[in-house]
C-alpha cells in the first residue's frame, strides 16, 4: 500500500472491474500495522490511527485487528485482499461499509477482526451487538 | 438524490467567527468523507478541508490551520466548519461537498452544495 | 503540495470546434486526476474522475486522457452550454490540489 505523503505512483497493473464492467480502483484505508491500544469494553472505537493509504491492489479491503492478552491490547489496520485469509480467517464481511467486529477462536488471547470496503472504514472499530448483522432489517440499514 | 444545503454565510468583522452547516441527504452519510472548498470573488477554487466518514481524521489547507475546524454529527447528516479569527483574505463562497469513494470514483468530488457567501469586511 | 499547472488559462472557440486543455501535476499522481466544469453563479460539476472516465450524466463529447504527471480534457465538438470555467484537481494525495482554472470562451 501506498501511503499519501510517499511519492510513488499507485500500482495500476492489475485493472478490477466490476459485474458491470466499471473500473474498480484502490480504496483507502487506515493502516498503522500493529499499535498498543487502549480500546477496551467500548462499543466502538476509533483507531488513532494517522495514516491513510491508498490499498496498492484494487480489490483490496480495509481490515482492523483488535488482540487482548494478558499484558496488552493491539490494534492492526491494514488493507487486504479478501480473497486471502488473514490471521488464518477468511474476511466474510469484506462487502460490509462498517467494521463490525467479529470475534475469532485463538488460544491465549481475546481476538477480534473485522473489514469492510468503504473509505477509511477501519478507522471506527464497531464491537456493539446493535450492529449485529444476523438482523436483516440491520443489514438493510448497515447496506443501504 | 443526493442533496447537499450550506447554510450559515454572512458578513463578519476581521478577527470574528462564524459557523457553517450543510445538511445532506439522498446517500449513506456516515460512511463518505465531507469536504469544503472555497472560491474568492472571481478567482479559482481552494479546498479547504476534509474529515472522514467516521469523522476521526480531519485536514486543513495551510491557509486555514489552526483557525477552522471541520466536523460533523453522523445522526444529524450535517457537516459543520468552525471559523475563527476570520480575515479579509477568507471571503469566499464556500462550498459543502462529498468525496466519492476511492474504490468507486477514486475519490473525486462528486456532489457540491449550492454554496454560502462569507464575507469579511468591517 | 502538489502544484496543478493548467494550460492555457483562456481560450476562444465556436461552437463545433474541438478544444483541448491540458493539466501538468508536480510529480506523478497516477491516473488520480479529475475535471470539473464551472458556471458564473454555480457550483462546479464533475465531468472525468480518474483521468478517463465520464462521471454519470456527462455528454460523451467530453473526453479525458493521460497518466502520470500530464493530462488532457477535450471537448470534441464544443456546444454553446460548454462555455464555462473548466478546473482540474488531483486526488492522490491530501491536500487534493486544483489546476487555476482554464475559462472557455465564444470567439
Known amino acids: 500500500t501506498i501511503p499519501p505523503h510517499v511519492q510513488k505512483s499507485v500500482n495500476n497493473d492489475m485493472i478490477v472491474t466490476d459485474n458491470n464492467g466499471a473500473v474498480k480502483f484502490p480504496q483507502l484505508c487506515k493502516f498503522c500495522d500493529v499499535r498498543f491500544s487502549t480500546c477496551d469494553n467500548q462499543k466502538s472505537c476509533m483507531s488513532n490511527c494517522s495514516i491513510t493509504s491508498i490499498c496498492e491492489k484494487p480489490q483490496e479491503v480495509c481490515v482492523a485487528v483488535w488482540r487482548k492478552n494478558d499484558e496488552n491490547i493491539t490494534l492492526e489496520t491494514v488493507c487486504h485482499d479478501p480473497k486471502l485469509p488473514y490471521h488464518d480467517f477468511i474476511l466474510e464481511d469484506a462487502a460490509s461499509p462498517k467494521c463490525i467486529m467479529k470475534e475469532k477462536k485463538k488460544p491465549g488471547e481475546t481476538f477480534f477482526m473485522c473489514s469492510c470496503s468503504s473509505d477509511e472504514c477501519n478507522d471506527n472499530i464497531i464491537f456493539s451487538e446493535e450492529y449485529n448483522t444476523s438482523n436483516p432489517d440491520l443489514l438493510l440499514v448497515i447496506f443501504q | 438524490e443526493v442533496q447537499l444545503v450550506e447554510s450559515g454565510g454572512g458578513l463578519v468583522q476581521p478577527g470574528g467567527s462564524l459557523r457553517l452547516s450543510c445538511a445532506a441527504s439522498?446517500?449513506?452519510?456516515?460512511?463518505?468523507?465531507m469536504t469544503w472548498v472555497r472560491q474568492a470573488p472571481g478567482k479559482g477554487l481552494e479546498w479547504v478541508s476534509v474529515i472522514s466518514g467516521s469523522g476521526g481524521t480531519t485536514y486543513y489547507a495551510d491557509s486555514v490551520k489552526g483557525r477552522f475546524t471541520i466536523s460533523r454529527d453522523n445522526s444529524k447528516n450535517t457537516l459543520y466548519l468552525q471559523m475563527n479569527s476570520l480575515r479579509a483574505e477568507d471571503t469566499a463562497v464556500y462550498y459543502c461537498?462529498?468525496?466519492?469513494?476511492?474504490?468507486?470514483?477514486?475519490?473525486?468530488?462528486?456532489?457540491w452544495g449550492q454554496g454560502t457567501l462569507v464575507t469579511v469586511s468591517s | 503540495d502538489i502544484q496543478m499547472t493548467q494550460s492555457p488559462s483562456s481560450l476562444s472557440a465556436s461552437v463545433g470546434d474541438r478544444v483541448t486543455i491540458t493539466c501538468r501535476a508536480s510529480?506523478?499522481?497516477?491516473?488520480?486526476l479529475n475535471w470539473y466544469q464551472q458556471k458564473p453563479g454555480k457550483a462546479p460539476k464533475l465531468l472525468i474522475y480518474?483521468?478517463?472516465s465520464l462521471q454519470s450524466g456527462v455528454p460523451s463529447r467530453f473526453s479525458g486522457s493521460g497518466s502520470g504527471t500530464d493530462f488532457t480534457l477535450t471537448i470534441s465538438s464544443l456546444q454553446p452550454e460548454d462555455f464555462a470555467t473548466y478546473y482540474c484537481q488531483q486526488s492522490y494525495s491530501t491536500p487534493p490540489t486544483f489546476g487555476q482554472g482554464t475559462k472557455v470562451e465564444i470567439k
Open positions: 439522498g446517500f449513506t452519510f456516515d460512511i463518505n468523507a
Open positions: 461537498a462529498r468525496r466519492g469513494q476511492y474504490r468507486e470514483i477514486a475519490g473525486a468530488t462528486d456532489y
Open positions: 480518474a483521468a478517463s
Open positions: 510529480q506523478s499522481i497516477s491516473s488520480y
